[in-house]
């Protein structure tokens, strides 16, 4: 054994000892901020974070002294590899501080962002509770639109300049760490090097995601078509039978999980409800009961109970007006055997399953607690997300719900209840896959520089239409930052983990169900009470990051790579049923339709042909003038023709589909109300009335400033002098 390796071991022992304490202090300060967002807690978190960062930077520099090629022991090698990654510490001190400030500010904006009554600024709605409640339950098109738009307008717009800076700094950090960009840095979590037969490259991840997505697409397209038909019933006249789905109608603020669409889409509504929310409320469940039931599930497969500290220190309900907390559910491994969950739990089936998910993280954290500090992590990020999801697959089954008294003992399973169950599962599991894939693809492209920042929103909604079949209910210009309206984006979390975890969870489920001696279709498997399944899972969990994930996966499922087959097998009966349901429907979507298309007017502008060498450049200022001119025309029309004083502003003239050869569409909304689109016929009358004023503003005429569908005015824009 080389002296280098022995020295490295000694160095790592010392590191592990010191890291434990500093990391704990930093984590604790972070917990305090997340559960109580105050200026003082931000400062404490930053101070503790700075100490941890300085320590890591120093240790990372020291770790460079041990060349990896001279280390034989895999455990030592993996630790050094991890420590030699410099993370943000490669940035200059001022840039590192700036990045920290940006991250904290984005987190605070997201968690404290609110929408307030313009007439009474004291009257506000936070995302949680309030806006999320609307997006989970409302069937009122305009209430949903108001919540959807307000959140993006209030929060997304504030985040935009910060996110632009964040991209630059994170890319700089990644490149200094020898990655192509920050997306590549994130993909590094899946990289395996130097383990014969188990290597996996960052590029391979992109390939695997792309090709598995192609395999999932047919199932998703049929789910999409079915959901579209049901949404047409719920929102008559708001949905196109061949178009994309309006983004604000999809079950939550982001259209990430479609779970809440179940009541609108349930195939066999006369059957007992397998969404057991009502039963939980009737039986007076609370947050504590939800987590205790989740704990029982894990214990039943031979995994450990939560620690006493977990129950004492976790924050499982919204502190309400007492203090402001980050309400997005998170699981915390603070170190020193201190495990906690932060969640503003509501008594719903959705949160019952989320509790299993979060507790899955804690089980993984507890299982690898014996590993060296630097190897205490999931084999890859997707594994960490998959653990609780495996449990949720069992916990959601009618069999399991019956066993814990949430479904009546006389609940009978048949083909119809099976389809109900699978559809509910698909709304959550299948519905989210294109969302996840598209979001991360967009970020990867942004980090790579493939989407210039003056086209972020344009490309976001193009991709959303093409890949997800979802359309923006109102157009968003480049002042918005819609991706950052999601927790994971504004809080700097990679996201492809939710895609990979979904494939892994079905691979794991298949293997664990075999261990549990389950017979019958995969979707009926409930692994609770199977210690064999629990042991098989635990053997993987305890490894943490000490083995390549490809090897860990192979140990459990017998294959080294992600595979979509088990997921497709699980949903096979539903897919067959959906194909039958959709036989008279259009499957797929046209990306041309939008909810505002009917009220839009197309404009074509020909500067060169009209002005020749005197042609000016069409830029943001010209567009501002155009929108102001239309707003003027609207004010004039309402005042002169309708005797109504309505103060239209340029922000009420909404432009979409701007093309470089200068054409675009626009429509007009009532002041301060994005959901109130002024009928196209009214806008046409207003433009006709002020046409010459608009033409003059741009030194153009009816032919060079063309409003398609609006008859040209009678006289030429500039009267020639009478001779």
């Amino acid at each position: 054994q080389s002296t280098i390796e022995e020295q490295a071991k000694t160095f790592l022992d010392k590191f592990n000892h010191e890291a434990e304490d500093l990391f704990y202090q930093s984590s604790l300060a972070s917990w305090n901020y997340n559960t109580n967002i105050t200026e003082e807690n931000v400062q404490n978190m930053n101070n503790a974070g700075d100490k941890w960062s300085a320590f890591l930077k120093e240790q990372s520099t020291l770790a460079q002294m041990y060349p990896l090629q001279e280390i034989q022991n895999l455990t030592v090698k993996l630790q050094l590899q991890a420590l030699q990654q410099n993370g943000s510490s490669v940035l200059s001190e001022d840039k590192s501080k700036r990045l920290n400030t940006i991250l904290n500010t984005m987190s605070t904006i997201y968690s404290t962002g609110k929408v307030c009554n313009p007439d009474n600024p004291q009257e506000c709605l936070l995302l949680e509770p309030g806006l999320n409640e609307i997006m989970a339950n409302s069937l009122d098109y305009n209430e949903r639109l108001w919540a959807w738009e307000s959140w993006r307008s209030e929060v997304g717009k504030q985040l935009r300049p910060l996110y632009e800076e964040y991209v630059v700094l994170k890319n700089e950090m990644a490149r200094a760490n020898h990655y192509e960009d920050y997306g590549d840095y994130w993909r590094g979590d899946y990289e395996v090097n130097g383990v014969d037969g188990y290597d996996y490259s960052r590029g391979q991840l992109i390939e695997d995601v792309e090709h598995t997505f192609e395999e999932i697409k047919p199932l998703y397209e049929h789910l999409h078509a079915y959901v579209r038909a049901k949404l047409m019933n719920a929102y008559p006249s708001y949905i196109s039978p061949i178009g994309c789905l309006p983004a604000h109608l999809l079950g939550d603020m982001w259209g990430r999980f479609w779970t809440n669409l179940y009541s609108l889409t349930v195939p066999f509504g006369q059957k007992p409800n397998i969404d057991v929310t009502d039963a939980m409320v009737d039986q007076a469940w609370d947050a504590q009961r939800i987590f205790k039931e989740a704990e029982k599930f894990f214990v039943s497969v031979g995994l450990p109970n939560m620690t006493q500290g977990f129950w004492e220190n976790s924050m499982l309900t919204d502190p309400g007006n007492v203090q402001k907390a980050v309400c997005h559910p998170t699981a915390w491994d603070l170190g020193k055997g201190d495990f906690r969950i932060l969640m503003c739990t509501k008594v719903t089936m959705d949160d019952f399953l989320t509790a299993h998910h979060e507790m899955g993280h804690i089980q993984y954290d507890m299982a690898y607690a014996a590993q060296p500090f630097l190897l205490r992590n999931g084999a890859n990020e997707g594994f960490h997300e998959a653990v609780g999801e495996i449990m949720s697959l069992s916990a959601a089954t009618p069999k399991h719900l019956k066993s814990i008294g949430l479904l009546s003992p006389d609940f009978q399973e048949d083909n119809e209840t099976e389809i109900n169950f699978l559809l509910k599962q698909a709304l959550t599991i299948v519905g989210t896959l294109p969302f996840t894939y598209m979001l991360e693809k967009w970020r990867w492209m942004v980090f790579k520089g493939e989407i210039p920042k003056d086209q972020w929103m344009k490309k976001w909604w193009e991709m959303k239409r093409e890949i997800v079949g979802v359309v923006e209910p109102v157009p968003h210009d480049e002042t918005y930052c819609d991706p950052a309206s999601l927790f994971h984006v504004s809080n700097d979390y990679s996201f492809i983990r939710y895609y990979t975890r979904t494939l892994y969870q079905f691979q794991f489920q298949e293997a664990l169900c075999q261990a549990a001696k389950h017979e019958g279709p995969l979707h009926k498997c409930d692994i609770s009470n199977s210690t064999e399944a629990g042991q098989k899972l635990f053997n993987m969990l305890r490894l943490g990051k000490s083995e390549p994930w490809t090897l860990a996966l192979e140990n459990v499922v017998g294959a080294k790579n992600m595979n979509v087959r088990p997921l497709l097998n699980y949903f096979e009966p539903l897919f067959t049923w959906l194909k039958d349901q959709n036989k008279n429907s259009f499957v797929g979507w046209s990306t041309d339709w939008s909810p505002y298309a009917d009220q839009s007017i197309k404009v074509r502008i020909s500067l060169k042909s009209a002005l020749g060498d005197k042609a000016y450049e069409w830029n943001d200022n010209e567009m501002y003038l155009f929108r102001s001119s239309v707003a003027y025309a609207m004010r004039q029309y309402f005042l002169k023709v309708k005797n109504q004083m309505i103060l239209f502003g340029e922000e009420d003239v909404r432009v979409a589909n701007l093309k470089p050869r200068i054409s675009f569409n626009f429509f007009v909304t009532a002041p301060k109300n994005v959901s109130d689109i002024i009928p196209r016929t009214e806008v046409e009358k207003a433009i006709r009335m002020s046409r010459s004023r608009i033409n003059d503003a741009f030194r153009l005429n009816d032919n060079s400033l063309e409003f398609l569908g609006i008859q040209p005015t009678l006289g030429p824009p500039n009267q020639p002098p009478v001779s």
């Epitope: 609307i134 989970a136 339950n137 069937l139 009122d140 009532a670 109300n673």
Partner: antibody
Framework: QVQLVESGGGLVQPGGSLRLSCAAS????????MSWVRQAPGKGLEWVSA????????YYADSVKGRFTISRDNSKDTLYLQMNSLRAEDTAVYYC??????????????WGQGTLVTVSS | GIVMTQSPATLSLSPGDRATLSCRAS???????LAWYQQKPGQAPRLLIY???NRATGIPARFSGSGSGTDFTLTISSLEPEDFAVYYC??????????FGQGTKLEIK
């Protein structure tokens, strides 16, 4: 089918208190905002108060702010209106109404039959 | 709050006639946020029209709504005997207060 049944109305002296209840059935109660709307004898409709589906947001007309309190018990599918410091001008039929919305005040697609509150000495 | 003014206060027409009821807001109201209700003596109000022009479930096609900005109209194309009642317009915005018009009484001539 949706049903809303008000109770608790009656004769009360000025300055007195009364608590109205509205028992709901036929829909997922916690998923909708609810309101109280009143109608003085021979007069038009006046919105009084609203509460979001979870009970997290409450709204009041200026005329009752500080005197009336709206609340709900989702486990019992029941809406309440606690009326204190009652005045003669609070005399009206009080309707419980289901909103089409969840959090913001909305339209009212279902109404109860009303309960009469008379404030008189 | 926004004041809703209905006109006329009373409208006397015969069955088969066309009825046009008007509602004017003191400031601009989103057409997404205007409704009409019908109330018969001794009964609770009933939602007729929402979002200015959409008929509520079970409402006959003879009822229609239109308008934007500050001026809104409820039209009953051909009056049936059961249509004689009081009609109220209501504005809801995203924040309270909700306000109703004072009502138009539609009576048999």
């Amino acid at each position: 089918q949706v049903q809303l049944v008000e109770s608790g109305g009656g004769l009360v002296q000025p300055g007195g208190s009364l608590r109205l209840s509205c028992a709901a059935s036929g829909f997922t109660f916690s998923s909708y905002a609810m309101s109280w709307v009143r109608q003085a004898p021979g007069k038009g409709l006046e919105w009084v108060s609203a509460i979001s589906g979870s009970g997290g947001s409450t709204y009041y007309a200026d005329s009752v702010k500080g005197r009336f309190t709206i609340s709900r018990d989702n486990s019992k599918d029941t809406l309440y209106l606690q009326m204190n410091s009652l005045r003669a001008e609070d005399t009206a039929v009080y309707y419980c109404a289901k909103a089409t919305t969840v959090v913001t005040p909305g339209y009212f697609d279902y109404w109860g039959q009303g309960t009469l509150v008379t404030v008189s000495s | 709050g926004i004041v809703m003014t209905q006109s006329p206060a009373t409208l006397s027409l015969s069955p088969g006639d066309r009825a046009t009821l008007s509602c004017r807001a003191s400031q601009s109201v989103s057409s997404s946020y205007l409704a009409w209700y019908q109330q018969k003596p001794g009964q609770a109000p009933r939602l007729l029209i929402y979002d200015a022009s959409n008929r509520a479930t079970g409402i006959p096609a003879r009822f229609s709504g239109s308008g934007s900005g500050t001026d809104f109209t409820l039209t009953i194309s051909s009056l049936e005997p059961e249509d004689f009642a009081v009609y109220y317009c209501q504005q809801r915005s995203n924040w309270p207060p909700i306000t109703f018009g004072q009502g138009t009484k539609l009576e048999i001539k």
